[in-house]
């Protein structure tokens, strides 16, 4: 009887495949007159279409690379695998979908890089005192979680330009605390102090050398610092095969993109590294603060987990920002930073207790739906994250990829990766819109009224000015 | 296409001057139209960036523009035991410009000021200042409502209340139909932000060169607040005027505060006594809701409507990913004393980091359909992020949600095409309102002229057989 394939009045194999994933096309010349060429496969076989003349591409998912998941992160870290498989090929015919799955494991003893980015405006004076032995304490605590820790240090205040900076009397430029009859450092935007190192005592030594500065207004320029600490990977020393924690500590609000105009700065942040040989952010006074969107993009690109370690008075603000910057955690910092050690350990635990998939470069014509199998083998539909995990747990996700119509570009690829992980699954997609029989097309065919058309897939495709089944 | 995208007129300013940062149409007393252009990084007489203002007479072929002359030298005056000082290097003259009647107001929001007394000082801070010019008569005046002679120690003792030292007056500016200059000063009251208002006529009459600190008796300033929602809110980042209380004898002020309430952003409508009539809150933190504001009647009901730009708004896309595209909110003014409610229409940008909504300009009735139209800029949108201006037509429901025309930047990437926009004035005298677009990164301004609209009417005659 009639069905979706036969009622659409299609006149070519390509059109037929686009009607529905259930439709097949018969290119057999011997197909009885009146039998539809576009029909369900079983109907075409019933109509005695030769099986080899039936065009019925089937969507498929093929694993191309599948290294097994690692148990431990120690040893040769470049061989550590946390996502499996690593590469698959999808073939999708128009409007069809295909399922594939991905497994993720939070491996034990994975290397960790922690970069401590500290607000050194005047109110952080007591905090600087509190963290002067943080390096060794952090190493002791983190040793329970990783045998391969590196820590680094950077500091920020704000853009050293009026009105954020005190510019009079002249003495205030070198000592912004001049009017308080005390001494503090000249204002700076962001300075990188200690490249990530496993010599944890160096952290203590460098922190002890630091001194606070002072700026005029309440918000600080920490987002400039986050951006630079994120994109200056060589300066900071972020390792490819490590968890990256960027610990941002402050007791104040932050400046955001478009605030810079109050200092006459309108050039948008370019998201590039501008930390020179002097380890200072050189574009501080020429480039605006970065937007949340740009920060998110760069943090994600560099697989950095941002931790907002902020005091009670601004915790709601940063909580709100964290909801707009996926993969960010927020912890409440005590007024003198004395609890920062526990805060980092807790935040790291929170990060490692969650696996959330992100998709990059998804073609517009594709849509994905996720089902998660987290703990107890329970399948949770519509979820692409798992919470409450322990280090060493493995989770899996079943993903359905559905294509809308037939994209122009026949081959595309996209990436699925857990947020904050280096590992990813690359999905190469081929959109199977064409029929194999098109390759045997006969241009100017005698079957089409002495060359008035191309004979293709069992039918005539007429040239300009000609109509009819034989272009007659 | 109402705006001709081919027959453009270009005006260029000095390299690196940021010519096009701000602009406005200027009509002289004979009705001749010119374009005032701000170039806040123009080099002054001592080769310091003082900024500058250019007056471009209308010529279809465009070209260079003469600059308006203002006193760009630092000034010092001794009054009793005090020394008053102005500092004009990097003052940003031309960061905002506005024309009214035959007067041009050009502001330098980063002009610094200090007062010295013995070993004490007020502190060198950006109070901001506006220069007024009547080009035909050569008259000049200055208005700097945030200058004062209070010393730093006094502010400390008073917990920094009523502290106008960082005002940046003239960061935004507008003149009411009645000739009152309204300045936005987002750094006023220790970065809460303030508004200053004074009649242009009184500014001229009270001005004496070299006095540096004087009083415009008819001026009024908004108030300080101890409400933390206003702290660092940059109230006055943008400003517009309109009619929002049903009383045609009064003018209301529209003020953008893009970082109000911990960066949520807000726009407030106030009466001329600075009493709040309405507050519109931002939708998303850090989206910079209130970066731009515009007032025009888009739905033809005779009441002013309000448009607000949030150029950093992030839209939730596939896979719940946020994409920073920018958004414009249309608030239609309801009948009667009702508050402006939820936005009637959301226009959302399409290009990542395009900053759609950075500038909004009323265009007048571009297509002669009885409804006013608007232009919205995405200075980093369009092909290769070169900038784009989109035209949206008015209709009885408000605005059409799809642009009727998209103007791609004729300048290279980084020119910030659309950073400043002005419309609703007919520059070429063809009866249709034109649009001027600033591209400070290219140091250029483009003039888009509206073309006559062809109205076709079809008649079908059916003959009896």
């Amino acid at each position: 009887g009639p069905n979706i394939c036969t009622t659409r009045g299609v006149s070519s194999c390509q059109q037929c495949l686009a009607v529905s994933p259930m439709c097949a096309w018969c290119s057999d010349e011997a197909l009885p007159l009146g039998s539809p060429r576009c029909d369900l496969k079983e109907n075409l076989l019933k109509d005695n279409c030769a099986p080899e003349s039936i065009e019925f591409p089937v969507s498929e998912a093929r694993v191309l690379e599948d290294r097994p998941l690692s148990d431990k992160g120690s040893g040769d870290s470049s061989q550590v695998t946390q996502v499996s498989p690593q590469r698959i090929a999808l073939r999708l015919r128009p409007d069809d979908s295909k399922n594939f799955s991905i497994q993720v494991r939070q491996v034990e003893d994975y290397p960790v890089d922690i970069y401590y980015l500290m607000d050194l405006s005047y109110s952080m004076k007591d905090d600087l005192w509190s963290i002067q032995n943080l390096g060794t304490k952090l190493a002791t605590q983190m040793r329970k979680l990783t045998s391969n820790l590196r820590i680094g240090f950077g500091a920020f205040v704000d853009k050293p330009v009026s009105p954020y900076m005190y510019i009079s009397p002249p003495e205030a430029l070198e000592n912004p605390c001049y009017d308080m009859k005390t001494t503090c450092l000249p204002m700076f935007g962001y300075k990188h102090v200690l490249t990530l190192t496993d010599q944890v005592t160096r952290f203590n030594e460098e922190v002890k050398k630091q001194s606070v500065s002072r700026n005029r207004d309440a918000p600080e320029g920490g987002f400039d610092a986050i951006m630079q600490a994120t994109v200056c990977d060589e300066k900071i020393g972020w390792r490819n095969d490590a968890s990256h924690l960027l610990v941002f500590t402050t007791d104040a609000k932050t400046h955001i993109a478009l605030d810079g105009r109050l200092a006459g700065i309108v050039q948008p942040n370019d998201g590039q590294c501008h930390v020179g040989s002097d380890n200072h952010y050189s574009a501080s006074t020429t480039m605006d603060y970065p937007s949340l969107g740009l920060m998110t993009e760069k943090l994600s690109q560099k697989n950095i987990n941002l931790i907002f370690a902020v005091t009670e008075n601004v915790v709601n603000l940063y909580q709100n920002y964290s909801e707009l910057i996926p993969g960010t955690t927020v912890g409440v910092l005590s007024m003198d930073s004395s609890n920062v050690l526990q805060l980092i350990v807790d935040a790291y635990g929170k990060i490692r207790s969650k696996v959330e998939l992100e998709v990059r470069d998804l073609p517009e014509e594709l849509s994905l739906s996720f089902n998660a199998t987290c703990l107890n083998n329970e399948v949770i539909p519509g979820l692409k994250s798992c919470m409450g995990l322990k280090i060493g747990d493995t989770v899996s996700f079943s993903i359905e990829a559905k294509v809308r119509g037939c994209p122009q570009e026949k081959e595309k690829s996209f990436t699925i990766k857990p947020v904050g992980f280096k590992d990813s699954l690359i999905v190469q997609v081929t959109f199977d819109c064409d029929c194999a029989c098109q390759a045997q097309a006969e241009p100017n065919s005698h079957r089409c009224n002495n060359g008035n058309g191309t004979f293709e897939c069992g039918v005539c495709r007429c040239g300009p000015g000609w109509l009819g089944s034989q272009c007659e | 296409l109402n705006l001709d995208p081919v027959q453009l007129t270009f005006y260029a300013g000095p390299n690196g001057s940021q010519f096009g940062f701000s602009l406005d149409f200027h009509k002289d007393s004979h009705g001749r139209v010119a374009i005032v252009v701000g170039a806040p990084r123009t080099l002054g007489p001592s080769q310091e960036e003082t900024g500058g203002v250019f007056l471009c007479p209308w010529r279809a072929e465009g070209g260079q523009c003469p600059s308006l002359l203002f006193d760009l030298r630092d000034e010092t005056r001794n009054v009793g035991s005090q020394t008053l000082q102005t500092f004009k290097a990097r003052q940003g003259l031309g960061a905002s410009v506005v024309s009214w009647s035959d007067v041009i107001v050009a502001c330098a929001p980063w002009q610094h000021w200090n007062v010295l007394e013995k070993t004490e000082e007020a502190e060198k801070t950006p109070v901001g200042s506006c220069f007024l010019a009547q080009p035909e008569s050569g008259r000049r005046a200055e208005y700097s409502p945030c200058r004062g002679n209070t010393l730093s120690r006094i502010y400390v003792e008073n917990d920094f209340s009523w502290d106008k030292r960082y005002c940046e007056a003239g960061f935004s500016s507008v003149v009411t139909q009645a000739g009152e200059l309204v300045l936005g000063a987002p750094g006023g009251y220790y970065f809460l932000g303030l508004l200053a208002q004074a009649p242009v006529a009184d500014i001229f009459s009270s001005y004496r060169p070299g006095i540096l600190l004087w009083h415009v008796s008819s001026q009024s300033l908004s108030f300080d607040s101890s409400n933390p929602e206003y702290f660092d809110g940059y109230w006055g980042y943008s400003v517009a005027v309109g009619e929002f209380d049903g009383d045609l004898n009064t003018t209301e002020y529209v003020v953008g505060a893009p970082t109000w309430s911990w960066t949520l952003g807000a726009v407030e409508i106030l009466d001329s006594y600075y009493q709040r009539l309405h507050r519109l809150r931002g939708e998303q933190m850090a989206s910079y809701f209130g970066h731009s504001v515009a007032v025009t009647d888009v739905n033809g009901d005779g009441r002013h409507d309000l448009l607000v730009g949030a150029p950093l708004y992030m839209e939730s896309r596939a896979d719940r990913k946020l994409a920073e595209v920018g958004r414009v909110y249309l608030f239609l003014q309801p009948r009667g004393p009702h508050a402006l409610g939820a936005p009637s229409l959301l226009l959302t940008g399409t290009q990542l980091y395009g900053r759609f909504g950075s500038a909004i300009a009323p265009l007048g009735d571009l297509d002669r359909d009885g409804y006013n139209d608007i232009a919205v800029a995405a200075p980093y949108g369009g092909p290769s992020g070169r900038g784009q201006v989109l035209v949206f037509l008015g209709q009885s429901e408000g605005l059409r949600s799809r642009p009727s025309q998209v103007l791609d930047s004729p300048f290279p990437t980084g020119s910030a095409f659309g950073f400043s926009l002005r419309g609703a004035v007919d520059i070429d005298d063809n009866g249709y309102p034109d649009l001027i677009v600033g591209a400070y990164g290219a140091n250029q301004v483009a003039v888009y002229r509206a073309q006559p609209v062809v109205k076709a009417s079809v008649q079908l005659l059916v003959q009896d057989s």
């Epitope: 009397p169 000592n175 001049y178 005390t182 001494t183 | 070993t119």
Partner: antibody, heavy 121, light 107 residues
């Protein structure tokens, strides 16, 4: 050349208020960045900073003694003064005045001759 | 308050020798430490400020080093007039505090 000299009563009875004077020359407290302060040293013990007065009349005190100290200046006569209320035997010490002239930071660059004070009934 | 611990409290050396005196702060004071010399019959004299900056008029045999919490005053090839009391003082925050002093005597 810069000189400072501290002077005081020599002996004072417990619970009384002690007044000390520092006379200086070679500089003026009208100069931005200039300050003069008091330091004391009980016999055989270390130095203890007490108070400081600055060019703009800003005053700083050691919190441990703040409630008992008052510092003031007479700029025209190049003098500063320190009053210590309710003295007791623990205040027996040599009292010095010293100058601070801002040069990137604040420190004592010139010291005066001390004045010895004994608290005794 | 920042506590300053100075060591040793007593030091005996001979002219021509090089000696070091140490000061340790209870918390980081960046570079802001000054050194003073006290000799009987004269006023206190500033030698070094900001950790390592030599006050004008002071001989170059005096030098200061250190930052954070640990600082050192070094006197190379001692002269007879160098035998005196030495004090360090932090000058970064109020209340300004001093070390307990080091008595340098001739051996």
């Amino acid at each position: 050349q810069v000189t400072l000299k501290a002077s005081g009563p020599g002996i004072v009875q417990p619970s009384q208020t002690l007044s000390l004077t520092c006379s200086f020359s070679g500089f003026s407290l009208n100069t931005s960045g200039m300050g003069v302060g008091w330091i004391r040293q009980p016999s055989g013990k270390g130095l203890e900073w007490l108070a400081h007065i600055w060019w703009d009349d800003d005053k700083r005190y050691n919190p441990a003694l703040k409630s008992r100290l008052t510092i003031s200046k007479d700029t025209s006569n190049n003098q500063i003064f320190l009053k210590i209320a309710s003295v007791d035997t623990a205040d027996t010490a040599t009292y010095y005045c010293a100058r601070s002239h801002y040069y990137g930071t604040f420190y004592f660059d010139y010291w005066g001759q001390g004045t010895t004070l004994t608290v005794s009934s | 308050d920042v506590q300053i611990t100075q060591s040793p409290s007593y030091l005996a050396a001979s002219p021509g020798e090089t000696i070091t005196i140490n000061c340790r702060a209870s918390k980081s004071i960046s570079k802001y430490l000054a050194w003073y010399q006290e000799k009987p019959g004269t006023t206190y004299k500033l030698l070094i400020y900001s950790g390592s900056t030599l006050q004008s008029g002071i001989p170059s045999r005096f030098s200061g080093s250190g930052s954070g919490t640990d600082f050192t005053l070094t006197i190379s090839s001692l002269e007879p007039e160098d035998f005196a009391m030495y004090y360090c003082q932090q000058h970064i925050e109020y209340p300004w505090t001093f070390g307990g002093g080091t008595k340098l005597e001739i051996k």
